[in-house]
Structure formats: structure tokens, C-alpha cells
């Protein structure tokens, strides 16, 4: 693949990923009301990281934000973090980036700076992509703890009624905008990669020696270094690999609620 | 405004079925569920089940699964019940709600009188 | 499924009166996600089908007068009627929205003396 294309393939990789880390930041289905195995309700619930919602079978569907800083769990806020840090270095990367194109001529601005600029998007485009990774993962694992633990406790306080009133707990599994994170994070890392891998092609090579004549023993004995090729890999017949981005469904794709539960 | 037709009675004998109807206007059908109600004379209201327009996905009532078989025709905006094997016990008043605000029930169809008798 | 209990099961009142009727679920009916309880209260009167009057175990549906008030949360809930008129005779019933299936309290029927 040609360096041109592997930084313009890198680029576009990354833009993706980034859009669907900036998706997935905003989207409300971080977690979603667990179905399985539950009392079933009229009403469904799920939360992202700015607000939660509930959607009731009516349709009727109400979000309240989250006014408060100091009230959030801190696992919450560390996500935030990430994402935003996400989305911060994706935009610096984005920018730098653009002027790195080998296909955009800015001035007399010379390889050897278009590379530098390529690895320095390319390295915040990895950054990117792994701060968005792990924030996702971090929510991830803060669902999976809570819901074994909700579990747990599934029918808790045993007040009221001689002791027969059952309280349930709302279980939350896995939303939508999890696996959209997942897939953006990743996205955005592999083009992160891809635009260093390009770097290495716009690197004025010092490695490819011109070939030198020795004179031994009076014979002239030409030798060509062509071992000594520079080992980038681009120019050479090095396979294809193709990116398959599986696509993220968001959950509000089948809003007309039913599934295995059509009860909402 | 919303309006919900039923047929006033239905006379029907013991072990025979009955397909109740329920026309819609006034609002979108397809986005509401659809949710059918019993009441016997002189008694209370039982919930029987619903069903959602835009893909036929229903909930029942277990007491009615066998019993009752909802359906909807979205062309006519009209909602089924079809009520089979009937006994004395299904005598009663069916009425039809479209779901509201709060998973409530503010427009009701008239009811359906249903008297099973040979 | 949740079962709905109403008392009492009968009341007779006076105009101008105030009236309070019970409703209590064998489950809370309080939805965590949005702190909203999801009871509903109706109003059937001989030969009519039922009338919303509460959802969200407090909130008046439009057009219904201000002397209906709900209250409570979880699982014990109260219809108050601050000022019974001639023509709220009829029966009242609780209905838990929450769970599926749906289910309705027995009704506690309102006379006037």
C-alpha cells in the first residue's frame, strides 16, 4: 500500500472512530434496564453519562440530567474524564492530521515535517482511541459489579404487608452506547496505527546506500546491496489488510420497544 | 379527538368463540398499545392483555392466554379480541384502551356485552 | 403477580364531606429510574366505562376537578376526596401500571346519603 493511501486510509479510519467515540459520549443507552430473567415492568429504563431516562409503554419517554458533580459516583466521573480526554486528543489529532495529508499542499512545508506531524496525530489518535476504550471498559465493569450485586439483594426490603411486600431492584445491563465505545475506541487506535505506519514512509530514507565499486585484487567486483532495502514494507508486495467494522446498532433503533421483551 | 367503536352486544353459545372489534380514530394506532379489559356484572375490572399495533407484540394476562387471542388490522385501525371455548364465565363487558401517559388508560370504548347462552 | 388491596371495600358520606379511600400493592410500585410511582386511579359509574382520574399516583388527569387529590408512594397509596359532590357516587379502583400483568384493587364504591 502506498504511503499516501495508508495516511489517507489512517485518516478516515480515525474520523470514524472518532465520530463514534463523540456518539458515544453523548448517547443516553450507557446502561439499559436488564429484561432477562426480571419481574417484567411497563416501563424501561436506561442511563448514560449525563442523564438517565425512563420510557414508558405509553412512548412517553422523560430524561433527567444529572445536576450535580459532587453527588455522582466517582467511577462515573473518571469516565467522563476519559471520554472528554477522548474526544479532546481526537479533535488535536484531527487538526494536526489535516495538515499532515501527503495529498494537501500547505507552503513549502517538506516530508520530513509532514511525517513528524503524521507520528504526532498518529500517537494522539492511539491515545485517543485507548482513553476511550478504557473509560468504556471502566463503566463496563462498574455494571458488572453492580449487577451481581443488585442480584444479590433482588427482592430486598421485606417491610410492610406481615413482611410480603417485595421490593425489586432495577438491574442494569450493557446499553448501546458501549459497544458503539468499544467499536470508536478501536477505530480510532487502528488508524492512529495506520497514520505511524505511514510516518515511516515519509521519513527520508538514510538507509538505502547508493552501491560502491571495490577494487580487490585487481578484478572489479561490483556488489549491490539490495539486502539492505529499507524494511518499511511499503513499495513491497505486503497484503492488504482489510478493517471490518461490524457497525454498532444503538438500542432506540427498534423504539417501537418490543424484542424478546415486548413489554415496553 | 380519540374514539374507540365497539360493537354494543354480542350473543353467543357455550363453546363457540367470538371476535370482538375495536376501531380506533382520533390519534396514530400504530404507536399505542392496545389493552382489553373484563368486567362481569356487578363485579370488578380484569386486565386481559395488549398488543402493540406497529408489530403485534402482546403481553397476557395468564388466566386469559388460553382463552383470549388479540389481533390488529392496521389498514382499518381496528383492534381484535377473539375470545374462544365460552363458558358462562366469559359473560361480561369487554372494553378496549389505548395506553396514556403514566402506562394508564384514559380513553375507553364503550365495552362489548358479551352473553354466552344456549 | 401484584395484588391490589382497596378499603374500604364501601363508604357512604354526606355531601360536602371529605373522603379518603385506600389502595395498597403487594410490590412497590415506585420506579427508581425516574422516583415516579405508577398508579393510576379510576372512576366508574354505574353504566359508563371507567374515567381516569390520577396516574403517577398523583397526577390529575385534565378536566378532572380539584377536590381529587392522590397521595403516598411504594406500595400503601390514598384517593382524598375533599369534598364529595352528588355526582361522585360510583366506584373507585387503583390499577398497578408497573408490573404485567396489569392489575386492578376490588374498588371501593362511594354512596351518598
Known amino acids: 500500500m502506498s504511503v499516501t493511501a495508508c495516511q489517507g486510509l489512517g485518516f478516515v479510519v480515525s474520523l470514524i472512530g472518532f465520530a463514534g467515540i463523540i456518539a458515544a459520549t453523548c448517547m443516553d443507552q450507557w446502561s439499559t434496564q436488564d429484561l432477562y430473567n426480571n419481574p417484567v415492568t411497563a416501563v424501561f429504563n436506561y442511563q448514560g453519562l449525563w442523564r438517565s431516562c425512563v420510557r414508558e409503554s405509553s412512548g412517553f419517554t422523560e430524561c433527567r440530567g444529572y445536576f450535580t458533580l459532587l453527588g455522582l459516583p466517582a467511577m462515573l466521573q473518571a469516565v467522563r474524564a476519559l471520554m472528554i480526554v477522548g474526544i479532546v486528543l481526537g479533535v488535536i489529532g484531527i487538526l494536526v492530521s489535516i495538515f499532515a495529508l501527503k495529498c494537501i499542499r500547505i507552503g513549502s512545508m517538506d516530508d520530513s515535517a509532514k511525517a513528524k506531524m503524521t507520528l504526532t496525530s498518529g500517537i494522539l489518535f492511539i491515545i485517543s482511541g485507548i482513553s476511550a476504550i478504557i473509560g468504556v471498559s471502566v463503566f463496563a465493569n462498574m455494571l458488572v459489579t453492580n449487577f451481581w450485586m443488585s442480584t444479590a439483594n433482588m427482592y430486598s426490603g421485606m417491610g410492610g404487608m406481615g413482611g410480603m411486600v417485595q421490593t425489586v431492584q432495577t438491574r442494569y445491563t450493557f446499553g448501546a452506547a458501549l459497544f458503539v465505545g468499544w467499536v470508536a475506541g478501536g477505530l480510532t487506535l487502528i488508524g492512529g496505527v495506520m497514520m505511524c505506519i505511514a510516518c515511516r514512509g515519509l521519513t527520508p530514507d538514510d538507509s538505502n546506500f547508493k552501491a560502491v565499486s571495490y577494487h580487490a585484487s585487481g578484478q572489479n567486483v561490483a556488489y549491490r546491496p539490495g539486502g539492505f532495502k529499507a524494511s518499511t514494507g511499503f513499495g513491497s508486495n505486503t497484503r492488504n489488510k482489510k478493517i471490518y467494522d461490524g457497525g454498532a446498532r444503538t438500542e432506540d433503533d427498534e423504539q417501537s420497544h418490543p424484542t424478546k421483551y415486548d413489554y415496553v | 379527538q380519540v374514539q374507540l367503536q365497539q360493537p354494543g352486544t354480542e350473543l353467543v353459545k357455550p363453546g363457540a368463540s367470538v371476535k370482538l372489534s375495536c376501531k380506533a380514530s382520533?390519534?396514530?394506532?400504530?404507536?399505542?398499545?392496545m389493552h382489553w379489559v373484563k368486567q362481569r356484572p356487578g363485579q370488578g375490572l380484569e386486565w386481559i392483555g395488549n398488543?402493540?399495533?406497529?408489530?403485534?407484540?402482546?403481553n397476557h394476562n395468564e388466566k386469559f392466554k388460553s382463552k383470549a387471542t388479540l389481533t390488529v388490522d392496521k389498514s382499518s385501525s381496528t383492534a381484535y379480541m377473539q375470545l374462544s371455548s365460552l363458558t358462562s364465565e366469559d359473560s361480561a363487558v369487554y372494553y378496549c384502551?389505548?395506553?396514556?401517559?403514566?402506562?394508564?388508560?384514559?380513553?375507553w370504548g364503550h365495552g362489548t356485552l358479551v352473553t354466552v347462552s344456549a | 403477580d401484584v395484588v391490589m388491596t382497596q378499603s374500604p371495600s364501601s363508604l357512604t358520606v354526606t355531601a360536602g364531606e371529605k373522603v379518603t379511600m385506600s389502595c395498597k400493592s403487594s410490590q412497590s410500585l415506585l420506579n427508581s429510574g425516574n422516583q415516579k410511582n405508577y398508579l393510576t386511579w379510576y372512576q366508574q359509574k354505574p353504566g359508563q366505562p371507567p374515567k381516569l382520574l390520577l396516574y403517577?399516583?398523583?397526577t390529575r388527569e385534565s378536566g378532572v376537578p380539584d377536590r381529587f387529590t392522590g397521595s403516598g408512594s411504594g406500595t400503601d397509596f390514598t384517593l382524598t376526596i375533599s369534598s364529595v359532590q352528588a355526582e361522585d357516587l360510583a366506584v373507585y379502583y387503583c390499577?398497578?401500571?408497573?408490573?404485567?400483568?396489569?392489575?386492578f384493587g376490588s374498588g371501593t364504591k362511594l354512596e351518598i346519603k
Open positions: 403517577w399516583a398523583s
Open positions: 398488543i402493540h399495533p406497529s408489530n403485534g407484540g402482546s
Open positions: 382520533g390519534y396514530t394506532f400504530t404507536s399505542y398499545w
Open positions: 384502551a389505548p395506553i396514556y401517559y403514566g402506562n394508564s388508560l384514559a380513553y
Open positions: 390499577q398497578n401500571s408497573y408490573f404485567y400483568p396489569f392489575t
